[in-house]
């Protein structure tokens, strides 16, 4: 059954002068045998023999899509007129990387537009780009199979000191952004409250400047700055942070009232609203979602709700008046 019912009307294709009724009469056993579909493709209206003038449609397996003209036409000489058609992968396969590298998120297939982040064990950095995006059927930039981890010069320099510092005799002093940061270090997305702007900075430079008491610099996320939810949240959390009573150093970052420093990754991870402790006098009057009623929440609850990207309007600081 076809919604485009064929009552034998003489059709003319865009690129044909001949009407189907003008095709020569054929004997019953003539026609075309089943054509060979492209790799990762199949014939939708499959049968043993096709009549002259008959079309077959090429479809692709899940995860592939047709590129080119997807119809073959049976010709009087028993051959097929076929344009260039192929089934191209619409997903990227999980790349094969050296065992030392960790892929996040770890999936078998990735859709076009999805990105992965490659990370190394503590004290090591990826010797090359760390972020890759699935485009068409391949990764951009291409992932070299020799890509590996290298010793993080930051870790080497710092000795027993904190990040952004270096050992000088028996004491720790701030690294110089100019002198100590000529080596490669991973990119960070950083916000400068003075210029009210965000930019990509090498980790070494960011940590050295932060150590030199540049309090206006805020870590947003690992990797170069890219528009999206991560950047959006990074900027919002920077605004909220000024009222946080907790400021706990954590890797490149500082964790606030609504966060916990993950011991295994040295990253600040948002708590979930039920994990918030009631204490604290940093209160906000808010409106949740499409609700009209007002609610008093503490800064931890506000931070966790916004981090989870749930709709919430902050009406004013302090308790709701009603």
């Amino acid at each position: 059954f076809s919604i485009m019912e064929n009552n034998g009307q003489p059709c003319i294709n865009d690129d044909e002068e001949m009407k189907e009724v003008d095709l020569p009469e054929i004997e019953a056993d003539s026609g075309c045998p089943q054509p060979v579909p492209p790799e990762n493709g199949f014939i939708r209206n499959e049968k043993q023999l096709y009549l002259v003038g008959e079309d077959v449609e090429i479809s692709c397996l899940t995860g592939f899509e047709t590129v080119g003209y997807q119809y073959f036409r049976c010709l009087p000489d028993g051959t097929w007129r076929q344009g260039d058609v192929e089934c191209q992968r619409t997903e990227c396969i999980k790349p094969v990387v050296q065992e030392v590298l960790t892929i996040t998120p770890f999936q078998r297939l990735y859709r076009i537009g999805e990105s992965i982040e490659l990370t190394c064990p503590k004290g090591f950095v990826v010797a090359g780009p760390s972020r890759y995006t699935c485009q068409g059927n391949s990764w951009t930039p291409p992932i070299s199979n020799s890509l590996t981890c290298e010793k993080d010069t930051l870790t080497k320099l710092k000795g027993h000191c904190q990040l952004g510092q270096k050992q000088s005799g028996s004491e720790c002093i701030c690294m110089s952004p100019e002198e100590d940061c000529s080596h490669h270090s991973e990119d960070l997305c950083v916000f400068d409250t003075d210029s009210n702007d965000y930019f990509t900075s090498p980790a070494c430079k960011f940590l050295a400047e932060k150590c030199l008491n540049n309090q206006q610099l805020h870590f947003l996320h690992i990797g170069s700055c890219q528009d999206g939810r991560q950047l959006e949240w990074g900027l919002e959390r920077t605004r909220l942070s000024s009222n946080s009573t907790k400021k706990e150093s954590c890797g490149y970052d500082t964790c606030y009232d609504w966060e916990k420093c993950s011991a295994s990754t040295s990253k600040c991870v948002c708590l979930l609203p039920p994990q918030c402790f009631k204490g604290g006098n940093q209160l906000y009057c808010v409106k949740m979602g499409s609700s009209t009623s007002e609610k008093t929440l503490n800064i931890c609850e506000v931070g966790t709700i916004r981090c989870a990207n749930r709709k919430m309007e902050i009406l004013h600081p302090g308790k709701c008046l009603a």
Epitope: P105, K260, S264, L272, P274, Q275, F277, K278
Partner: antibody
Framework: EVQLVESDGGLVQPGGSLRLSCAAS????????MAWVRQGPTKGLEWVAT????????YYRESVKGRFTISRDNAKNTLYLQMDSLRAEDTAVYYC???????????WGHGTLVTVSS | DIVLTQTPLTLSVTPGQSVSISCRSS???????????LYWYLQKPGQSPQLLIY???DLGSGVPNRFSGSGSGTDFTLKISRVEAEDVGVYYC?????????FGAGTRLEIK
């Protein structure tokens, strides 16, 4: 030391009601959200409901909405779960749980068995 | 709802052996700001569940460091190096990245 002690459950007929309570000690009860989690013979562990510090916000799993009510009495350091219109599939051990900064369910009570059967 | 599939269902090991338990999610647990809320619990016979691992790989308070967690996206693993007799029970993974919070069906660990 954090302690959570659930009241005795029991056998209830389908359509019947039961109220569970959980006595909390060893921490400032009113400073924490609280939750109920159940463990059924067929469905395994399931989060049931959560309540905020003062009871002004409550959250439920879809299958118990409109039938179960979570509440608390901060003066008595007690958490409650009122279960109405009980069904056979509500048969489970019900645990009272408290979060920490590590997890939503960091501390658990010993559990109480609720059997819904005719 | 997110479905967490644990494998194997049962493990029978001798003390001192290392074992791994897999937890696969029906959807990625990585949220859009880069956080993954995946936990591991152990329920010893006749007891309530106890927290082992939080946020994929962080060790719960008082948990021996022979337990470790790893993974990302949809695939997670709990590893116990050098199993001890006291490790018997049912191991559950749990996710809180998407509402409602859901648990895996459990993996029973027995000692030979």
């Amino acid at each position: 030391e954090v302690q959570l002690v659930e009241s005795d459950g029991g056998l209830v007929q389908p359509g019947g009601s039961l109220r569970l309570s959980c006595a909390a000690s060893g921490f400032t009860f009113s400073d924490y959200y609280m939750a109920w989690v159940r463990q059924g013979p067929t469905k395994g562990l399931e989060w049931v409901a959560t309540i905020n510090y003062d009871g002004s916000s409550t959250y439920y799993r879809e299958s118990v909405k409109g039938r179960f009510t979570i509440s608390r009495d901060n003066a008595k350091n007690t958490l409650y779960l009122q279960m109405d219109s009980l069904r056979a599939e509500d048969t489970a051990v019900y645990y009272c749980a408290r979060p920490s900064t590590e997890a939503l369910f960091a501390y658990w009570g010993h559990g109480t068995l609720v059997t819904v059967s005719s | 709802d997110i479905v967490l599939t644990q494998t194997p269902l049962t493990l029978s090991v001798t003390p001192g052996q290392s074992v791994s338990i897999s937890c696969r999610s029906s959807q990625s647990l990585l949220n859009d700001v880069g956080n993954t809320y995946l936990y591991w619990y152990l329920q010893k016979p006749g007891q309530s569940p106890q927290l082992l691992i939080y946020l994929v790989s962080d060790l719960g308070s008082g948990v021996p460091n022979r337990f470790s967690g790893s993974g990302s996206g949809t695939d997670f693993t709990l590893k116990i190096s050098r199993v001890e007799a006291e490790d018997v029970g049912v191991y559950y993974c749990m996710q809180a990245s998407h509402a409602p919070y859901t648990f895996g069906a459990g993996t029973r660990l027995e000692i030979k």
